[in-house]
Interface confidence: low
């Protein structure tokens, strides 16, 4: 849609005569009729397909036409069209003499024509006026013309409709070529997408208006770049949402189990060495002369059972003394008067001579210990099973029977239901005491994030007249791209064709 504008500037008819050569009485009271039509190689009579306009009497014989656009819009003359400007045209300008006040064609004598000019050619849409001058034997007409687009129409053919807006459907003004120019803070094909706060994380943050940064589930912080750890996570951090990666020295699902009791609580007394041995458990290795779980008790020197091979210990002021059983001697009854010939090894132990037969050593079979293999080993006395596992003696070995949720030789490993990556589409898995839970990313749902929830707004084919449908990812709405000749949000309205003008 646009307007062909014709600005009449000067008409010269010095002799004041009609086209027939007859003079006007008293002078030629001159008005103009203009016909605009499609391009014709030879301009011929017929309908003014692009429009027609007439002027009132503008002067007598020779006169300049003043620019009167402010006072009623008579000059420049306006020839509006509501179609795509084809780039070519034909123009007929007739100067007529008006003997009276009635300027209708049927009210004029047929020889009232003063002059007639016809031009044709190419004309691009633009602000610049084209100046032209046409001279006949008796007259001269100087005029200029141009084609401009109507409000809200743009492009080389005035065919691009663009209406600035600032609402839910877009936030833009129009560029000279009809392309949208987004208002500050908006982006996207139709400027419907707000530009989030600078630095707002592309995946984890979003916004509904400019300079905002709203966090998706599992994220926090001004720029939505900090993950939210698992609810109840005590001594841990996360790199993805709902994680609880334990700080050094902490364990368990919520990192609330102390794996470094030694450092955090220093339980061992009297210079003992502390060793962590599991969640909230530790072992103190006492210095000589101390005992107790935390080495808090001083002991007599006999408390450390220094006498071997069944010797009995006697406390003395300056230490202790071992009373050895028959067949043994030495400070700790460590030497035997027996030899392998006396078969001193019980329970199938093998005897090995030492010190040229003056001594011996027993090599015990599994499950037996002691100098003479006289003691049966209870492999469960040290309670090796973690996390409440039950210790079972099984012949030469031991075995841990684990509680549900634990595994490993000593039940030391927590079974993770998440180990097999059950959550689809990048869902985050959380171990719970009685199973697992998936936290789904935007656009997915279901127990395992297996259901895609975003819809294809174009699936219902909402666009008419062979228009192309586009889905707007951010809003799950559709946008129709109309072919030439159609407008409307669904391309449902045809652009009107020009009316026919009788000449």
């Amino acid at each position: 849609s646009g307007v062909f504008q014709l600005q009449l500037q000067e008409f010269i008819n010095e002799r004041g005569v009609l086209a027939s050569g007859r003079p006007c009485e008293p002078g030629c009271r001159t008005f103009f009729r203009v016909c605009l039509k499609h391009f014709q190689a030879v301009v011929s009579p017929g309908p003014c397909t692009f429009g027609t306009v007439s002027t009132p009497v503008l002067g007598t014989n020779s006169f300049a036409v003043r620019d009167d656009s402010s006072g009623g819009g008579r000059n420049p003359l306006q020839l509006p069209f509501n179609f795509t400007w084809p780039g070519t045209f034909s123009l007929i300008i007739e100067a007529w003499h008006a003997p009276g006040d009635d300027l209708r064609p049927e009210a004029l004598p047929p020889d009232a024509l003063i002059s007639k000019i016809a031009i044709q050619g190419s004309l691009a849409v633009g602000q610049n006026w084209l100046l032209d001058e046409q001279t006949s034997t008796l007259t001269r007409l100087r005029y200029s013309y141009r084609v401009i687009c109507s409000d809200n129409y743009y492009g080389d053919n005035c065919s691009r409709l663009c209406k600035k807006r600032n609402d839910h459907f877009g936030h833009y003004v129009c560029q000279p070529d009809g392309n949208l120019s987004c208002l500050p803070g908006w982006t996207g094909e139709y400027c419907q997408q707000p530009i989030c706060l600078s630095g707002c994380h592309e995946q984890n943050g979003y916004c509904s208006k400019p300079a905002e940064c709203l966090c998706r589930p599992g994220w926090q912080g001004r720029l939505c770049n900090e993950c939210i750890p698992h609810n109840g996570c005590r001594h841990g951090t996360c790199s993805t949402p709902w994680q609880c990666t334990c700080d050094e020295g902490w364990g368990g699902l919520f990192c609330d189990q102390d794996l470094n009791y030694c450092t955090h609580h220093s339980p061992c007394k009297n210079g003992a060495t502390c060793s962590n041995s599991g969640q909230r458990s530790y072992t103190c290795t006492c210095r000589p002369g101390y005992t107790g779980v935390d080495c808090e008790l001083e002991l007599s020197e006999c408390d450390s059972n220094p006498c071997r091979n069944g010797g009995s210990c006697k406390d003395q002021e300056d230490g202790y003394h071992c009373l050895c059983p028959p067949g043994y001697y030495g400070l700790h009854c460590e030497h035997s008067t027996l030899s392998c010939a006396d078969s001193p090894c019980f329970n199938g132990g093998s005897c090995r001579e030492r010190n040229q037969g003056a001594n011996y050593a027993c090599e015990c079979p599994p499950n037996f210990t002691g100098s003479n293999c006289e003691k049966k080993v209870d492999r469960c006395t040290s309670n090796p099973c973690a996390n409440g596992g039950q210790c079972l003696n099984r012949g030469p070995s031991r075995m841990c029977r684990c509680r549900p949720g634990f595994t490993g030789t000593y039940c030391e490993l927590h079974v993770s239901d998440c180990a097999r990556n059950p959550c689809a589409h990048g869902g985050t898995c959380h171990d719970l005491e009685n199973g697992l839970m998936c936290t789904c990313p935007a656009g997915f749902s279901g127990r395992r994030c297996e259901v895609r929830t975003s819809i294809d707004a174009c699936a219902s084919s909402p666009c008419f007249n062979r228009a192309t449908c586009y889905t707007d990812l951010s809003t799950d709405t559709f946008v129709c791209n109309c072919p030439y000749g159609f407008v409307g949000s669904r391309c449902e309205f045809p652009v009107g064709l020009p009316p026919s003008f009788p000449w």
């Epitope: 560029q175 070529d177 392309n179 987004c182 982006t187 996207g188 094909e189 400027c191 997408q193 530009i195 592309e202 995946q203 689809a424 589409h425 990048g426 990313p441 656009g443 889905t471 990812l473």
Partner: antibody, heavy 124, light 111 residues
Framework: QVQLVQSGAEVKKPGASVKVSCKAS????????ITWVRQAPGQGPEWMGW????????NYAQKLQDRVTVTTDTSTSTAYMELRSLRSDDTAVYYC?????????????????WGQGTMVTVSS | QSVLTQPPSASGTPGQRVTISCSGS????????VYWYQQLPGTAPKLLIY???QRPSGVPDRFSGSESGTSASLAISGLRSEDEADYYC????????????FGGGTRLTVL
């Protein structure tokens, strides 16, 4: 019509740098992002990086980000890709391509218009 | 080694229907749209399908795309000799701070 015209073929020695240009015409240059993709002989395309001529945002492939820089000169509607410390396995056809959708802040939309490609050969 | 997996070759006779598959993961096809490019010998790739199943203007409706879960496929019906080309799938991948990934390509031969 809308087109991207790239600079001519280059032969470089290992360790050198190359700068490929991509001149846009037929559309408003500052409305669209430009992506750079390379394709070694007989291989599939490999994404290198992207720049928005609209707001200057950039994004690079992690494997190349220490060696590649993409820039634009809006006064001449031209995009540039510079690759430094060239190696023999950088021998490839280098393409520039335009985002399908204008004025997007990140490069998650495909590329609809491609340049004709620039052959870069790295050989001692 | 390409992040998206395509069969290296496919073939069919004129008029036939052929399908090319593209397999990815939750960080690419599972979360983002799939795009298909056609590359004729010695030319730049051409956008064939965008946003899983949309055709740019000028692409015949013989070409169609679909996506399910972490896989996608391109179907060409009424095969013609001019369809002989390399076909690549592509998608945005949000791992490693985000990047585009392509398939290794499928060479389509029209017998």
């Amino acid at each position: 019509q809308v087109q991207l015209v790239q600079s001519g073929a280059e032969v470089k020695k290992p360790g050198a740098s190359v700068k490929v240009s991509c001149k846009a015409s037929g559309y408003t240059f500052t409305n669209y992002g430009i992506t750079w993709v390379r394709q070694a002989p007989g291989q599939g395309p490999e994404w290198m990086g992207w720049i928005s001529a609209y707001n200057g945002n950039t994004n690079y492939a992690q494997k190349l980000q220490d060696r590649v820089t993409v820039t634009t000169d809006t006064s001449t509607s031209t995009a540039y890709m510079e690759l430094r410390s060239l190696r023999s396995d950088d021998t490839a056809v280098y393409y520039c391509a335009r985002d399908r959708v204008p004025r997007i802040p990140v490069t998650t939309e495909a590329f609809d218009i491609w340049g004709q490609g620039t052959m870069v050969t790295v050989s001692s | 080694q390409s992040v998206l997996t395509q069969p290296p070759s496919a073939s069919g006779t004129p008029g036939q229907r052929v399908t090319i598959s593209c397999s990815g993961s939750s960080s690419n096809i599972g979360s983002y749209f799939v795009y298909w490019y056609q590359q004729l010998p010695g030319t730049a790739p051409k956008l064939l399908i965008y946003r899983n199943n949309q055709r740019p203007s000028g692409v015949p409706d013989r070409f169609s795309g679909s996506e399910s879960g972490t896989s996608a496929s391109l179907a060409i019906s009424g095969l013609r000799s001019e369809d002989e080309a390399d076909y690549y799938c592509a998608a945005w991948d949000d791992s490693l701070s985000g990047h585009w990934v392509f398939g290794g390509g499928t060479r389509l031969t029209v017998l």
